[in-house]
């Protein structure tokens, strides 16, 4: 299709080489009142089209995205050619940063209902640059945490070094929806609730003498509880003796609950005590069996191919640790009678 009639928007993505970062493009098809370019023939305000503009409905889930190759080749369907770019409804998600994402992206409705809809499309010229060292050292992260129940704020990474007074007007989106009343480079959250979690996008306009473009940054906001003040507790085994049958295989499970920590480095391991000797056992990897906002339950098993007489003289110890401290639970094997 002919893209010369598409409206054009220029965007800049300045990414940090230090952190993982995502980016999004919205299919900003015009609303009915702004949609004079959704028609093959541009209309003056006094002219009235015979057909309603395409975007009569707010359902933007059915759009098609293309990339325009720089060599003038035909448009490429994003979904077929770019595995690191994902389409979710009307939003295009770039999962990895890099200058190779620079280019022209076109979106238009899948359903063309009338000849007037042919040029109902948006062309986004995306320029991607790595952040220069000259940029501010303490810019806000693209991953920000909000502590549940407390106050907090969400900062626009590309503007976080500027004072509120210097900052240009910012347009914020949350999960693709416009937050029309938020206009500063920092959103103040009076009290953090779980619904504050999500993907926030901040846009502001920069211009020079020739043209203007939108500078965009994406912030992943996570709502968290405060770091635990407790060491992990062992949920299983509970008993310190276990009845076993000699010669049979045996699996002993150690399940431990770890409270939330922002920097989470849980340790769960098994070791064996035999008189004065003590050694760590090579056992299968630990696995998370339940994860909530407040805590995580991790399990690690010790597997004996067959229980021997020697095993009855040993103690099997599960050791768990977080940044606060450690807990142990030992199990003595006892032969089953009868």
């Amino acid at each position: 299709f002919n893209i010369s009639g598409c409206s054009t928007k220029k965007l800049l993505w300045t990414y940090s080489t230090r952190s993982e970062e995502e980016f999004v493009l919205f299919c900003d098809l015009p609303e009915p009142q702004k949609s004079h370019f959704c028609h093959r023939n541009r209309l003056s305000p006094k002219q009235v089209p015979e057909h309603l503009p395409f975007m009569g409905s707010n359902d933007l889930s059915d759009v098609q995205w293309y990339q325009q190759p720089s060599n003038g080749d035909p448009l490429e369907d994003i979904r077929k050619s770019y595995p690191h770019i994902i389409q979710d409804k009307c939003t295009l998600h770039f999962l990895t940063p890099g200058v190779n994402n620079s280019g022209s992206y076109i979106c238009r409705p899948k359903m063309i209902k009338s000849p007037y809809d042919v040029a109902c499309c948006v062309k986004m010229i995306l320029e991607v640059k790595p952040q220069t060292n000259a940029s501010c050292e303490y810019s806000a992260s693209h991953k920000q945490d909000l502590l549940l129940g407390s106050t907090g704020s969400i900062s626009c990474p590309s503007l976080s070094c500027q004072s509120d007074a210097q900052s240009p007007a910012v347009t914020w989106y949350k999960n693709g929806k416009l937050l029309s009343v938020e206009r500063s480079n920092r959103i103040v959250v009076d009290e953090v609730y779980d619904y504050h979690q999500g993907t926030y996008v901040c846009d502001y306009t920069q211009s020079d003498t020739v043209s203007s473009w939108t500078v965009r940054a994406v912030v992943q906001v996570r709502t968290i509880v405060g770091d635990t003040k407790l060491k992990p507790d062992i949920l299983d085994p509970v008993e310190d003796t276990l009845e076993v049958e000699l010669g049979k295989p045996l699996t002993i499970s150690c399940k431990a609950r770890f409270g939330f920590e922002r920097v989470f480095n849980p340790v769960i391991k098994w070791y064996i005590k035999d008189s004065d000797l003590e050694w760590e056992v090579s056992v299968p990897e630990a696995k998370s069996i339940k994860s909530t906002l407040k805590d995580e339950i991790i399990e690690r098993n010790i597997i004996l191919e067959k229980v021997t007489q020697r095993d009855l003289r040993r103690k099997f110890v599960c050791f768990v640790q977080n940044s606060i401290g450690n807990t142990t639970q030992s199990v003595q094997l006892k032969e089953k009678r009868g």
């Epitope: 106050t151 416009l178 937050l179 009343v181 009290e191």
Partner: antibody, heavy 118, light 111 residues
């Protein structure tokens, strides 16, 4: 309960400060304390809110931003300062508190009448 | 803040009947919507919060529902005491749960 005071007759272009006093609870808990007005025979019109938690955030209707100022004076008192008043500001002014669970104004004062006239 | 458009401005129905009042938000506010009842000379009373949850002490004859940016208050089995003006209100502002803009109101007349 909530009680508004400070209403009365004021000259056009004059100023007035309304006070909302809470009893039975204090703003040491976190609430949105707000002002709403209702012109005679007309609908409800939101004016402003203040968050009584640590951020102290204030929120204004676009038309109220430059003439009206909401403030928390103490743990039981919120005020609304109004300047450059005109006849269009004649209304009953209500103080209201949001409900922490049932989001919306769960508690209202009886209202105070402000008349702007020469 | 947001613009809330309420329709109709007035509606009348017989005792035992049903009344439906609509409210349209200028942009998406999710479930952040409240409904109030106001009788002459009194402050408003909260009926519904979070678009469809009944405020404490409110009769189950009042119900709220939502579809996109359209919100509906339904009063069934109408009683004389339901004669009042009803208002919708957005209870969200940006990212904070601030009760702000009201709809224009709907007068309910019970015959």
């Amino acid at each position: 309960s909530l009680e508004e005071s400070g209403g009365g007759l004021v000259q056009p272009e004059g100023s007035l400060t309304l006070t909302c006093t809470a009893s039975g609870f204090s703003f040491n808990s976190k609430y949105y304390m707000c002002w709403v007005r209702q012109a005679p025979g007309k609908g409800l019109e939101w004016i402003a809110c203040i968050y009584t938690g640590t951020t102290g955030s204030t929120y204004y209707a676009s038309w109220a931003k430059y003439r009206f100022t909401i403030s928390k004076i103490s743990s039981t008192t919120v005020t609304l300062q109004m300047t450059s008043l005109t006849a269009a500001d004649t209304a009953t002014y209500f103080c209201a508190r949001d409900d922490r669970v049932e989001h919306g104004y769960g508690l209202w004062g009886p209202g105070t009448l402000v008349t702007v006239s020469s | 803040a947001y613009d809330m458009t309420q329709t109709p401005s007035s509606v009348s129905a017989a005792v035992g009947g049903t009344v439906t009042i609509n409210c349209q938000a200028s942009e998406s506010i999710g479930s952040w919507l409240a409904w109030y009842q106001q009788k002459p000379g009194q402050p408003p009373k909260l009926l519904i919060y979070s678009a469809s949850s009944l405020a404490s002490g409110v009769s189950s004859r009042f119900g709220g529902s939502t579809s996109g940016t359209e919100y509906t208050l339904t009063i069934s089995d109408l009683e004389c005491a339901d004669a009042a003006t009803y208002y919708c209100q957005s209870t969200f502002y940006g990212v904070n749960p601030v009760p702000t803009a009201f709809g224009g109101g709907t007068e309910v007349v019970v015959k």
